[in-house]
């Protein structure tokens, strides 16, 4: 009996092939792993993405797929190769029984296997039965350049391309990879099928209500009429974009992914590859009122992940749920009651809400920025989006308490001028995942490939930590934080900056023998101090110890507790100058801050001393925040004195280069 969706109609019972005997065993000591969606209802067992090792060629992928079919046939199992991936990730998509997973994991070249899972449109309501006139206020919103040099790819539902908002602006590609709609009585109605994609295309580039009115778009259908798709379909869509880019290279590309599924290693990996090929990916954080790191592609570090706020800059509530939050969100954008094209008719408008709408706003802003400065890299674009955002306007009380410090308080905004930001030294703060509570647990925060790690700090809610250090990993510096015995875990916090032609290194001093404290300085000619870190092996640094002695007025020196090793980040870059700002408080307060003034950028943020009542230090925009235990639990002894140390830098070279351009 033929399978209802016809998926098995081409199945071939592969006979035992000669190739079968040639199966090489996987390299000794490397074990392929199996992954599946943590959210059970979203799993799609029976379909698997087999991801092969990075250097695997297409011919090897095809051979591995055939080998799997042959070995499965010997065991009496039917398999169907649905797609062979190349161009983005090597691998293949296979329909097979879960019984074959053990066999598949042992195939040569296999890196990991992921069970397919669902992804969903991130707008609520799916379609409002309401027609709203367009909000056209040309006097209020006339961007200087509507993103005309940029192509925006939209991976979504089908769209109504003849809607007057987007007519002539959106090219519907022939790409379609969607699952069957759920339910036997589902009635496909064109306007419902097109609703989500049409609205988002309008938000990005609509004539009246669009952000980047000049941007051209291409749509790929990866979500069905119910707004549902699959990880595998999205992967094939991303591969399609990469192949299009290779066949016909155009200007800057922005890819909008207004969808979310459970955490997916393979979807994140594909996004990473596409981002490293120079494509800007923007995605919805998700509408689950949850940590965005639990969803994909929201959790992919290379993707710009957007949460939703309303007109009052408050996080959007969507029924019982709402916008996602946490360290995987880059910034927020308007996502409540957004007026845009409705697929009910070619002149209809409708209001929709969700992180999809927020992501569409940011995709539009990105298109405009890239149109003004087509050479911007992903890292430069992300830093500019952060820099020009409205700061500290979101009511953080909406977020769970443990997520407030991790969630960026940033709402996307168009830059006041699309040119002339080149002189600025841009930095952002990157939080690691939580280390977990074990004694030797560590957490690692990393910068993007073309960013410099200029400083490293750590934070623990319990105060039990063993500091942090900058260390080399794969030819790049990373920030590693260390948990302490009895601690609930730590975060590492990296300060990641755009510093062209920089040469940075870490200078370390081991714990000092003398009671003077440990110190380390930047001794190389032309190198300036951009950050200080300290790490210690003792469990409770500083308790009943003599106070830390710090030399007066030493801008190029890191100083710390005598039982700690101290790490100085020292950088040489054209025109780079830095200064230290040190704010001390005489008695414990829950927070002490120190900010860099206009024209200077915070590169380093640390706390002195490293004693156990200091929870840690982290940068929020241009302010260094040092958090301590509650005053009432610490008392007001001299042991309670805390100092926040900020290192503020600027680049005279960038400023001069910018002036020469003008």
């Amino acid at each position: 009996q033929e399978d209802e969706d016809g998926d098995y109609e081409e199945l071939v019972l592969a006979l035992r092939s000669e190739e079968d005997g040639l199966a090489e065993a996987p390299e000794h000591g490397t074990t392929a792993t199996f992954h599946r969606c943590a959210k059970d209802p979203w799993r799609l067992p029976g379909t698997y993405v087999v991801v092969l090792k990075e250097e695997t060629h297409l011919s090897q992928s095809e051979r591995t797929a055939r080998r799997l079919q042959a070995q499965a046939a010997r065991r009496g199992y039917l398999t169907k190769i649905l797609h062979v991936f190349h161009g983005l990730l090597p691998g293949f998509l296979v329909k097979m029984s879960g019984d074959l997973l053990e066999l598949a994991l042992k195939l040569p070249h296999v890196d990991y296997i992921e069970e397919d899972s669902s992804v969903f449109a991130q707008s609520i309501p799916w379609n409002l039965e309401r027609i709203t006139p367009p909000r056209y206020r040309a006097d209020e919103y006339q961007p200087p350049d509507g993103g005309s040099l940029v192509e925006v790819y939209l991976l979504d539902t089908s769209i109504q391309s003849d809607h007057r908002e987007i007519e002539g602006r959106v090219m519907v590609t022939d790409f379609e990879n969607v699952p069957e709609e759920d339910g036997t009585r589902f009635h496909r109605q064109a306007s419902k099928c097109d609703s989500h994609g049409t609205h988002l295309a309008g938000v990005v580039s609509g004539r009246d209500a669009g952000v980047a009115k000049g941007a051209s778009m291409r749509s790929l259908r990866v979500l069905n009429c119910q707004g549902k798709g699959t990880v595998s379909g999205t992967l094939i869509g991303l591969e399609f974009i990469r192949k299009s880019q290779l066949v016909q290279p155009v200007g800057p590309l922005v890819v909008l992914l207004p969808l979310a599924g459970g955490y997916s290693r393979v979807l994140n990996a594909a996004c990473q590859r596409l981002a490293r090929a120079g494509v800007v990916l923007v995605t919805a954080a998700g509408n689950f009122r949850d940590d965005a790191c639990l969803y994909s592609p929201a959790s992919a570090p290379e993707v710009i992940t957007v949460g939703a706020t309303n007109a009052q800059d408050q996080p959007v509530t969507l029924g019982t749920l709402g916008t996602n939050f946490g360290r995987c969100v880059d910034l927020f954008a308007p996502g409540e009651d957004i007026i845009g094209a409705s697929s009910d008719c070619s002149t209809c408008f409708v209001s929709q809400s969700g992180t999809s709408q927020a992501a569409a706003h940011v995709a539009g802003i990105a298109a405009m920025m890239l149109s003004a400065e087509p050479e911007l890299t992903l890292a430069e674009l992300r830093q500019r989006l952060i820099h020009f955002s409205a700061k500290d306007v979101i009511n953080e009380a909406w977020f769970p308490e443990d997520q407030r410090v991790l969630t960026p308080n940033l709402v996307a905004a168009l830059p006041p001028s699309t040119h002339g930001a080149g002189w600025q030294l841009f930095c952002r703060t990157v939080w690691s995942a939580h280390s977990g509570p074990t004694r030797m647990a560590t957490a690692v925060a990393r910068c993007a490939p073309d960013e410099e790690l200029l400083s490293c700090s750590s934070f623990s809610r319990s105060g039990k930590r063993r500091g942090e250090r900058m260390e080399a990993q794969g030819g790049k510096l990373v920030c590693r934080a260390h948990n302490a015995f009895g601690g609930e875990g730590v975060y590492a916090i990296a300060r990641c900056c755009l510093l062209p032609q920089a040469n940075c290194s870490v200078h370390t001093a081991p714990p000092a023998e003398a009671s003077m404290g440990t110190r380390v300085h930047c001794h190389q000619q032309g190198h300036v101090l951009t950050g200080c870190s300290s790490h210690w092996e003792v469990e409770d640094l500083g308790t009943h110890k003599p106070p830390v002695l710090r030399p007066r007025g030493q801008p190029n020196q890191c100083v710390g507790h005598r039982e700690a090793s101290i790490h100085a980040s020292c950088c040489h870059a054209p025109g780079l100058e830095c200064k230290v700002k040190e704010h001390g408080i005489p008695a414990p307060q829950e927070q002490v801050t120190v900010a860099c003034e206009e024209g200077w950028t915070l590169t380093g943020c640390s706390a002195l001393p490293g004693t156990s009542h200091v929870l840690g230090a982290y940068a929020v925009d241009n302010t260094c925040v040092v958090r301590s235990r509650d005053v009432s639990t610490t008392g007001s002894t001299s042991e309670g004195a805390v100092t926040a140390v900020a290192i503020c830098c600027r680049s005279r070279h960038l400023a001069q280069a910018s002036q020469e351009l003008q």
Epitope: P555, K579, V580, E582, H583, G584, T593, V594, A641
Partner: nanobody, 127 residues
């Protein structure tokens, strides 16, 4: 150089108020933070409060928090200390101090990191 001159001290009843002023002159553009310290007879110099020109985070000594308020008028190059609900233990000579701005900028309770000092003004609180 920066010159600092305090004024406003005197004798006051417990529970009363005083407002101290500190006028800065000279190279005031080179000042980063300004602060108040006090020294009772036979005791070490004690930090009271400090402020930077942008008025960042303002630290106060635990013993004066909620009663004393520090402020700064940049246009007049003057630092103030509003002292309310005074207690006999607030009796001391009150000194104004300033730190330099430059590559290393300090605001906090460590008197050794202050570069410029005034002559002091006496505050006596009687019970």
């Amino acid at each position: 150089q920066v010159q600092l001159v305090e004024s406003g001290g005197g004798l006051v009843q417990a529970g009363g108020s005083l407002r101290l002023s500190c006028a800065a002159s000279g190279r005031t553009f080179s000042v980063y933070a300004m602060g108040w310290f006090r020294q009772a007879p036979g005791k070490e110099r004690e930090f009271v409060a400090a402020i930077t020109s942008p008025g960042d985070s303002i630290p106060y000594a635990h013993s004066v928090k909620g009663r004393f308020t520090i402020s700064r008028d940049n246009a007049k190059n003057t630092l103030y200390l509003q002292m309310n609900s005074l207690k006999p233990e607030d009796t001391a000579a009150y000194y104004c101090a300033a730190t330099k701005s430059g590559n290393y900028n300090y605001m906090g309770p460590d008197p050794k990191k202050y570069h410029y000092w005034g002559q002091g003004t006496q505050v006596t609180v009687s019970s």
